[in-house]
């Protein structure tokens, strides 16, 4: 006869009750809220009332765990999902309800991923509004333009020129360089951070740009810009199906019509619609290359990235990988391929899944040339697939509100207690940094900051010159020896130039997979 181990109790199905429920309707932590559809009573050992089965034990209902991505969490345990914290309570996740930062990206030569997650292809060859808050009747505060050259046809010469107009300033990103073409009126919250493969620009409290020094540009916005932006990046309203809203407020079906509407100058020709299957960017005319590209790009859905695939949809990046790698003029140049895989790995890292995907033969990256002693550098540079993005250095002496958790690339490693002087490329004691201290904060050499901006009585503009601090009242423009400011440059200035040299990459790909 059936005997049960306590605290389980024996249930024998009654022969006279066809609707009785038995072992087949055992309540578990995972099915507790589901109704049972019994196809016939099964006798066996059940948990006593007030308890449910979990793995092979009986547990009190309030001791049931929660589940997230196949992992079990005990009551009271927390997980971070995006920018929200969730606590396990009564078998359910109880989460905070913050609107997270939103990221819009240009990926590769011609793909865009909007703030709301819509991916589309637009191989435009003009200058376009990537994102701005000059939308409808809004009095805007910033505009980011992107100009493409050589990005609409198979080429390794694709270059993007990004123009950032904010706070009266103009900053240009092009060919791996940052040019401050006009300083911002208030540089208090302006920082240029070089970190690994990336350059991160902090452009105020709610706007930042992350650039891989080549074709990948991400604009990160805080919640304050929700539903206030427009351009190729969409409108950050949480809804994907209105992301292709043109500059004249039409929701377009075709990304080409949408993209053309955000052109800065009407003198630049509209992009024409080309059926994708006849585009050279799908390798349709080169079966050998197509097979090679397909199998290489599959790394994105292979075991290497399997943990990340559960969190970040690889499909947009797979499309970009195939398009861009096919677009590269020769199979030997895998920069297009490597950049796309790196872009996906970067997003994975931001979601807490660090993937070490580079190998000695697949897009290798070394930092050894930065460790050459004859360069006189006194800190060790090491490759890291996920190192803190905005570290404290002499040039950034205070912790920064970094838009990304970590970045890959070559990073300086200093002995404990020392920090990097980026200028001298050496590790120094923090007190040896050329900084100015004011109001309990440390400012890097060259920084111009506004103190007490909302208090006209005490408002000051302070300038840290190496270690000498000079301050002046906000309303008095005198003080520093500055020549007259040049006339503002029109943001719509078109550039036309012959770019003949191939883009630079600090890694190579010895072969595709």
């Amino acid at each position: 006869s059936l005997s049960c181990r306590p605290p389980m109790v024996k249930l024998v199905c009654p022969a006279d009750n066809l609707r009785a429920e038995g072992l087949e309707c055992t309540k578990t932590c995972q099915n507790y809220d589901l109704e049972c559809m019994s196809m016939g009573c099964v006798s066996g050992c059940l948990c006593p009332p007030g308890m449910v089965r979990h793995e092979n034990r009986c547990v009190a209902l309030e001791r049931c765990p929660c589940f997230h991505q196949g992992k079990e969490y005990a009551p009271g345990e927390t997980v971070k999902i995006g920018c929200n914290t969730c606590v396990c309570q009564d078998r359910k996740w109880n989460c905070t309800d913050h609107v997270c930062d939103a990221t819009c990206s240009t990926i590769g030569m011609a793909h865009y991923l909007t703030f709301d997650g819509l991916k589309y292809l637009f191989p435009g060859e003009c200058q376009y509004v990537l994102v701005q808050d000059y939308c409808g009747s809004n009095p805007g505060t910033f505009r980011i333009l992107v100009g493409n050259k050589g990005c609409s046809h198979p080429s390794v010469k694709c270059k993007k020129r990004v123009t950032i107009l904010v706070e009266g300033g103009e900053i240009e990103l092009f060919d791996g360089e940052v040019n401050v073409k006009r300083p911002m009126k208030d540089e208090t919250h302006f920082e240029v951070v070089e970190s690994g493969r990336y350059i991160i620009l902090l452009l105020g409290k709610a706007l930042s740009v992350v650039w891989d020094r080549h074709l990948s540009i991400s604009v990160v916005l805080k919640q304050t810009y929700q539903e206030k932006v427009c351009g190729l990046c969409g409108n950050f309203d949480g809804i994907q199906n209105n992301d292709l809203t043109s500059s004249n407020l039409q929701v377009e079906e075709d990304p080409v019509d949408f993209g053309n509407s955000w052109k800065v100058s009407s003198q630049c020709a509209d992009t024409r619609k080309v059926p994708l299957d006849s585009s050279p960017a799908t390798c349709h005319n080169n079966i050998m290359k197509q097979t090679m590209v397909d199998s290489s790009c599959r790394i994105l859905t292979s075991d290497v990235f399997q943990d990340c695939n559960k969190l970040v949809d690889p499909e947009p990046y797979l499309d970009v990988c195939i398009y861009d790698t096919c677009s590269c003029e020769s199979i030997g140049d895998c920069a297009c391929f490597c950049d796309t895989i790196a872009a996906y790995a970067h997003v994975c890292a931001q979601h807490g899944k660090v993937v070490t995907w580079r190998t000695a033969t697949l897009c290798p990256q070394s930092c050894e040339e930065r460790n050459l002693r004859e360069n006189g550098y006194e800190c060790e540079w090491r490759y890291n697939s996920c190192a803190p993005a905005c570290q404290v250095t002499c040039q950034h002496p205070e912790p920064l509100a970094c838009p990304v958790q970590c970045v890959e690339g070559c990073h300086a490693h200093c002995p404990p207690g020392k920090i990097l002087d980026e200028l001298l490329q050496t590790c120094v004691d923090p007190e040896d940094c050329p900084v100015c201290e004011v109001a309990g904060r440390r400012f890097a050499s060259g920084k111009k900051v506004t103190l007490n901006p909302s208090d006209p009585e005490h408002c000051q503009i302070c300038h840290c010159d190496v270690v000498n601090l000079t301050c002046e009242a906000c309303q008095e423009p005198g003080g520093l020896v500055v020549p007259p400011t040049d006339a503002p440059v029109s943001p719509t200035t078109l550039y036309v130039e012959d770019i003949s040299e191939p883009p630079l990459h600090d890694f190579y790909c010895s072969r595709l997979l």
């Epitope: 401050v180 070089e194 040039q395 050499s445 300038h463 190496v466 040049d486």
Partner: nanobody, 128 residues
């Protein structure tokens, strides 16, 4: 604070070369990014070239790329502008400028408002 004293300049023929120097006072020269600007009569001040504190790479206006070279000697507290294949349109007053702002190894400012200290200016005239 730094004082900048310029030398060089003068009258040359088209196709000739000329070198401008800009000497800085003070012991912290290495902490300053340096640049050259020029202003032709009746025109706005124009960016010519810049070299960051680290001196690793330099930046040029399209109009002088391949002809002009900016360099610095931190031991001598001096920045130079070597001008080759000079053209009549290079005629201007050339000024060196300094800022202690460090934007990074791959960043610079091409705007005069990004610089805090200026040399006295030196005339370069290129005749055809």
């Amino acid at each position: 604070q730094v004082q900048l004293v310029q030398s060089g300049g003068g009258l040359v023929q088209a196709g000739d070369s000329l070198r401008l120097s800009c000497a800085a006072s003070g012991r912290t020269f290495i902490r300053y990014a340096m640049a050259w600007f020029r202003q032709a009569p009746g025109k706005e001040r124009e960016f010519v070239a810049a070299i960051p504190q680290s001196g690793g790479r330099s930046y040029y206006a399209d109009s002088v790329k391949g002809r002009f070279t900016i360099s610095r000697d931190n031991a001598k507290n001096t920045v130079y502008l070597q001008m080759n294949s000079l053209k009549p349109e290079d005629t201007a007053v050339y000024s060196c400028a300094a800022t202690s702002t460090y934007y990074g190894r791959s960043a610079y400012s091409s705007h005069s408002g990004g610089y805090d200290y200026w040399g006295q200016g030196t005339q370069v005239t290129v005749s055809s």
